[in-house]
Amino acid sequence: MNGRVDYLVTEEEINLTRGPSGLGFNIVGGTDQQYVSNDSGIYVSRIKENGAAALDGRLQEGDKILSVNGQDLKNLLHQDAVDLFRNAGYAVSLRVQHRLQVQNGPIGHRGEGDPSGIPIFMVLVPVFALTMVAAWAFMRYRQQL
């Protein structure tokens, strides 16, 4: 059996204020350093303890950073992306994509573009419960006749 991982993808705008030691995180990725196969995007590899990002709490390791101060991070060399952050100023606005893993199920694979990453048990359990309640009510009704 192959494992299946479903992801819930959300986007968020995160505004950070540069602290005494900077923004406080590391990145990987870029056109010359693909971190995710077939994706040259920029990903957060490390959040530094007590840094601006850690104290803010919203940016997470594994997040994909889509833009910095409105500037797209697509098709950038790794060092160019690093330089963009270093020159971003005191107040830095990040457009971030979070990928939340919601289930490790049995087989199949859901493409990234498919937004319906809801675990099947979340649908089946309520349906099963409703069926049981309906069956019980029907039996009680028959007994009263």
């Epitope: 590391n26 990145i27 990987v28 590899s45 790794h78």
Partner: nanobody, 125 residues
Framework: HVQLVESGGGLVQPGGSVRVSCVSS????????IGWFRQAPGKEREGVSC???????YYVDSVKGRFTISRDNAKNTVYLQMNSLKPEDTAVYYC???????????????????YWDQGTQVTVS
């Protein structure tokens, strides 16, 4: 479990050469910055050389032209070749690893590193 193990070093004559190696286990080097740092008796730990996650090398001014950093990702090893050694190069040399590139500073900044080895003594005398 991330681990760095250093080898090499020892006693060298002024003008001599030595190579120190840093082998990583528990992770692959490809996406890591690796730095070499040293601490002389009574002094603060200082950056010597580093190689970032895309292979760009950096050196502190005092070792430029004498020290060479290199990495062999297949062997999960980073090397520091030290030539034309001077008595002031005497110190405990440490290697350190950091996942990715800091958006705040170059890899010569020791505050950005998460993983450190136990250090190896280099004495130039």
């Amino acid at each position: 479990h991330v681990q760095l193990v250093e080898s090499g070093g020892g006693l060298v004559q002024p003008g001599g050469s030595v190579r120190v190696s840093c082998v990583s286990s528990g992770f692959i080097l490809d996406y890591y910055a690796i730095g070499w740092f040293r601490q002389a008796p009574g002094k603060e730990r200082e950056g010597v050389s580093c190689i970032d996650s895309v292979g760009r090398a950096y050196y502190v001014d005092s070792v430029k032209g004498r020290f060479t950093i290199s990495r062999d990702n297949a062997k999960n090893t980073v090397y520091l070749q030290m030539n034309s050694l001077k008595p002031e190069d005497t110190a405990v040399y440490y290697c350190a690893a950091d996942f990715g590139s800091s958006v705040d500073s170059t890899c010569l900044n020791n505050q950005q590193y998460d993983y450190w080895d136990q250090g190896t003594q280099v004495t130039v005398s």
